[in-house]
Interface confidence: low
């Protein structure tokens, strides 16, 4: 039986239940390499506080469909006077990058995961030649994801000081070249994640083969090399190398860009201070504020929430978008699909589709940018779920009582994108961190 | 049985022209991404061209205005035209597919002869 994610098969990954200390490790198409957990466990479980493991899904009992994975064991439990088995079941969703498992819950006998990845999408837009896991766990269980940063099309120019040369990486995953059309990017061999451009020539001098690392609990390490022997005639017999160290900053902080901090023989060493490398609990909150001693700042944007069934109401050319935020009420246009974004075509209003959901919700600050997503909304010919991304700017003279109004600005792949002004925006920072 | 089969190979001469075709089986074609890499003696495996299931084409720059990448979804089959052929252009060439299902698929591939 072929693997059904190959994508994914590389990898031992990881997923946590922060309430019950549990530490899941799984391999969807081998066994975990953990003694405890037997030679066939795909997924392992880790019980911190007893420092216990036990296997929860055995990679010889797998079955697969297109969007489910399940993984039984031989292990009985008792659920409602009923003998089950033990088992893992791991949903998959079209996502834009590899993602991250997700703990979603546990019963006695089913420990359920929900996986938003690439592999799982009905076109390969979105899949890359080489990406790796771009997550990774502290010691303290707490997530750290780069996954944000990761670009689909494009490159991140990194800050050095040679004019003759520029130096482009991508995180976890090579650049495509592809959608980035007519930028000097163009000349950038597939597969590479870190592009040296000099003049009209472009050499690949890294790609990426293991997945994001944690040496401090505040610095990540990626590490991209050279795969193919070819040596490159201005390393000096070397071998390129490229080490990004993600810093998270001890206070609150705009974003800043990548720099370089040492370069010798084609080994590239790069430095980027970035709240992405913080805890994500850090960052982002499944409510509509972010306030209290682990996030340095009090964002409140419930005000924002409309009652009475009245949406705000966005223009964008051939469709109209209806938008509910921070509450859960329904939007009347949008047929009871439990939408905060609802998108209605002009042309046609019977047309209508959820381009997120109310009970999807993520609120994120990171690096002075506060995002409102709204995702799982209505399928795209793709697979993926459509999905709304609200960028917030302070305004503190916001026209309609200081709420102001979104914007629409543009779409790529599914996702919307819109701006909103807004005084409920101002972010009100402590320093304690 | 998934596959892939290449055919249309042959000796030319320089400034001729080929057309290869990469006849897909046991797969759905049309959510893959194709591309054609070649393979001259003595050297490593080059990438060629690439078609992804949602149209994109790019090329490498060594064939780049001269060779052009296509597909016919109802046949299950890419092809790849070659024009201005030149010398440095024999290798065997092989078609692959990548779907977000299945582990990449090669074909078997054809040869290529530019010759006078």
């Known amino acids: 039986q072929a693997a059904p994610f190959p994508e994914l098969c590389s990898y031992t990954w990881e997923a946590v239940d922060t309430k019950n200390n549990v530490l899941y490790k799984i391999n969807i198409c081998g066994s975990v390499d953990i003694v405890q957990c037997g030679p066939s466990s795909a997924v392992c479980m880790h019980l911190l506080k007893t420092r216990t493991y036990h296997s929860v899904g055995d990679s010889v009992l797998r079955s697969a469909t297109r969007s489910l994975l399940e993984f039984n064991t031989t292990v009985s439990c008792d659920q409602q006077g009923t003998n089950h088995r033990v088992q893992s079941s791991i949903a998959f969703l079209c996502g834009k990058t590899l993602g991250t498992p997700e703990f979603v819950t546990a019963t006695e006998c089913v420990h359920y995961f929900e996986w938003r990845t690439t592999a799982a999408c009905k076109k390969d837009i979105f899949k890359a030649n080489k990406e790796v896991p771009c997550y990774v766990f502290d010691e303290e269980l707490r997530k750290h994801d780069l996954n944000p940063l990761i670009k689909l099309s494009g490159a991140y120019l990194v800050d050095d000081s040679d004019p003759d040369t520029s130096l482009f990486i991508n995180v976890c995953r090579d650049i495509d070249t592809l959608r980035d059309p007519g930028s000097q990017l163009r000349a950038c061999p597939p597969g590479t994640a870190a592009c040296l451009v000099r003049g009209h020539q472009a050499f690949d001098v890294g790609q990426p083969r293991d997945g994001l690392k944690v040496v401090r609990k505040d610095r990540l390490v990626l590490s991209y090399v050279r795969e193919e022997a070819g040596k490159l005639d201005f390393c000096d017999g070397h071998s390129p190398a490229v080490t990004i160290t993600f810093v998270c900053p001890s206070e609150r902080r705009e974003g800043t860009i990548p720099k370089l901090t040492a370069k010798s023989n084609c080994r590239y060493e790069i430095e980027w201070i970035t709240e992405y490398a913080c805890h994500r609990d850090y960052l982002e909150s499944k409510t509509c504020s972010l306030s209290g001693e682990q996030q340095d700042v009090s964002i409140d944007l419930t005000p924002l929430a409309q009652s009475g069934g009245s949406s705000y109401i966005s223009d964008g050319k051939e469709y109209l978008f209806y938008l509910n935020v921070c509450g859960e009420t329904e939007i009347q246009f949008c047929n009871k699909k439990q939408a905060a974004v609802c998108q209605v075509k002009k042309s046609d209003t019977s047309q209508v589709k959820a381009a997120g959901r109310y009970h999807n919700q993520t609120l994120r600050y990171s690096d002075g940018d506060l995002t409102l997503i709204y995702f799982g909304g209505d399928e795209c010919s793709s697979g993926f779920q459509r999905m709304s991304v609200i960028n917030f700017e302070c305004n503190k003279t916001a026209g309609n009582d200081g709420k102001g109004t979104p914007v629409f600005t543009g779409e790529v792949d599914c996702t919307y994108f819109f701006t909103w002004d807004t005084e409920y925006a101002c972010v009100h920072h402590h320093h304690h961190h | 049985q998934v596959q892939l089969q290449e055919s249309g190979g042959g000796l030319v001469q320089p400034g001729g022209s080929l057309r290869l075709s990469c006849a897909a089986s046991?797969?759905?074609?049309?959510?893959?991404?194709m591309d054609w890499y070649r393979q001259a003696p003595g050297k490593q495996r080059e990438w060629v061209a690439t078609?992804?299931?949602?149209?994109?084409?790019t090329y490498a720059d060594s064939v780049k205005g001269r060779f052009t990448i296509s597909r016919d979804n109802t046949k299950n089959t890419v092809y790849l035209r070659m024009n201005s052929l030149k010398p440095e252009d024999t290798a065997v060439y092989y078609c692959?597919?990548?779907?977000?299902?299945?582990?990449?698929?090669w074909g078997q591939g054809t040869q290529v002869t530019v010759s006078s």
């Open positions: 078609l992804a299931s949602y149209g994109w084409k």
């Open positions: 046991g797969i759905i074609f049309s959510d893959n991404r």
């Open positions: 692959k597919a990548s779907s977000p299902v299945l582990n990449d698929i």
